[in-house]
Interface confidence: low
Amino acid sequence: DTHKSEVAHRFKDLGEEHFKGLVLVAFSQYLQQCPFEEHVKLVNEVTEFAKTCVADESAENCDKSLHTLFGDKLCTVATLRETYGEMADCCAKQEPERNECFLQHKDDNPNLPPLVRPEVDVMCTAFHDNEATFLKKYLYEVARRHPYFYAPELLFFAARYKAAFAECCQAADKAACLLPKLDELRDEGKASSAKQRLKCASLQKFGDRAFKAWAVARLSQKFPKAEFAEVSKLVTDLTKVHTECCHGDLLECADDRADLAKYMCENQDSISSKLKECCDKPLLEKSHCLAEVENDEMPADLPSLAADYVESKDVCKNYAEAKDVFLGMFLYEYARRHPDYSVMLLLRLAKAYEATLEKCCAAADPHECYAKVFDEFQPLVEEPQNLVKQNCELFEQLGEYKFQNALLVRYTKKVPQVSTPTLVEVSRNLGKVGAKCCKLPEAKRMPCAEDYLSVVLNRLCVLHEKTPVSEKVTKCCTESLVNRRPCFSALELDEAYVPKAFNAETFTFHADMCTLSEKEKQVKKQTALVELVKHKPKATKEQLKGVMDNFAAFVEKCCKADDKEACFAEEGPKFVAASQAALA
């Protein structure tokens, strides 16, 4: 339905608080280097303008599209050219090209300092002095570091952030109350950002058909009692919401997400018995709850799929008449029966089924040709099952840190051209799959593990796209979304790689090592491990373990010494020499 003024429509739908929050997020995700104050000024100007349009929708410029209004506002930033370089050229374009141009310049790895957490008393004072500014600063800092963060969900995080401070700044032990909550928000936020980044990559790189297939599979697992027509409707609406958010249309996205939540809560009987507790919550919490809702119980009497998809003589006729609907139906029926499969596996099975029909429906005896199609699924199912089993056994044997190290070695050998910080970040996150998924019951392990790995590998793909260095990474990232993980799993030692020259500087450490947190120490050691593998890609596990054990002993010894710096200066070169000898 059309409105005379789009900006007035969204302001009225969302309310001033959410409107301002979303505009701040949008601007911060586009202009990631701009200072906070600059963004607040722009947001205030847009808000005042929106209010004039609410008062009179026929007022000057109120009929302009949101892209035009926001783009015009961004292009008023005086330092655009010096801060962003060629991004300033976007301002010479007309909509919709200008918005596309801004989107292309979003930086997944912006050169921003890590966020340092001040003392609790300092934070509480800032919160009490100016709560509104404090919360805006949170939105700004998260959005600029995560330019694809799901905007309406970020408002939910901000609400939780506010609640944590409101509660804990009055507590007897502020730190004990606040710090665990902030840690939880940080970890959940990073996970949420990475999950959304995969959704946007899926839409942007593989199109909405790929996203819709993902959504059919996931929603069918969550809502196995819902019928196909219902799942299809939810998929269509969800695709619109994510297309908008990934495209920078944050006001429309938040508005449509609220409509979807309303629809789901009004139609619970047709969707899932699990929605009830979500639907009593306020909007932001409700939408979050619906997105995270557990799978409903599977209907007890589901018949075999073979009747409709293998044994029926009408398979090819049905497929030919409506390929996407027929495949969608197959995916729905398979997914609702298999909450124990990862979404990516379900999509591989649908792809295999489609390939079989394409081949067999052109054969002399189609039925004979596709009669064994379900048997062909077995190796596809067993591959991730075995992978999860082996890696969980390894995780249980080694613990998280050493499991991460095993993955660091494995991935550095596969793709040694990738930058060391990226290999460390990605392998550390791959390693977290153990603690996240291996403790779960068997039926939940594969969906947890493989779908989490897809999110982490997407981060590798996104970072690699910015600075491509490996043909193998490009191939795995671009050929097939659903086969990314198997593609990376199948990579072997890169025989063509010319080992990196040894650089003593890389293995020189100082007394500041001793004051680092446990996590920072791990990252230092893991950085050294990656560099070792890049220097000696054919080093055995035993050789690398020996070097890393010596490294840990050397650091521990020097951190206990009275003159730490002198110890590092003396023992460091010995460690380097011993390592070179061990790896020779």
Epitope: A307, D308, S312
Partner: nanobody
Framework: EVQLVESGGGLVQSGGSLRLSCAAS????????MSWVRQAPGKGPEWVSA????????RYAESVKGRFTISRDNAKKTLYLQMNSLKPEDTAVYYC????????GSQGTQVTVSS
């Protein structure tokens, strides 16, 4: 948009007959198996009967076997359920679904069998 609209329900004496229809739109009707499902007051949905896309293969719940007949007219994009020898326990809202689902996705049509 996928739409299913049921009709033909009503009040009938025990032993009587009714014929339910389900008009489909928004998808290739002939490509999909269809089912009839019913929900009695205060109870969960119960699968009644199913038919494949071509109309050759039909299946029935034990409680309706021999009394109900499912059929379809793909040219008219319509699914039917002929209900004979109706009993009070057949009283429910009847609705059609795509595939083998037992979830309510449409408004349904009320069937009331009085004794």
């Amino acid at each position: 948009e996928v739409q299913l609209v049921e009709s033909g329900g009503g009040l009938v004496q025990s032993g009587g007959s009714l014929r339910l229809s389900c008009a489909a739109s928004g998808f290739t009707f002939g490509s999909f198996g269809m089912s009839w499902v019913r929900q009695a007051p205060g109870k969960g949905p119960e699968w009644v009967s199913a038919i494949d896309g071509g109309g050759a293969d039909t299946r029935y719940a034990e409680s309706v076997k021999g009394r109900f007949t499912i059929s379809r007219d793909n040219a008219k994009k319509t699914l039917y359920l002929q209900m004979n020898s109706l009993k009070p326990e057949d009283t429910a809202v009847y609705y059609c679904t795509i595939g083998q689902s037992t979830s309510r996705g449409s408004q349904g049509t009320q069937v009331t069998v009085s004794s």
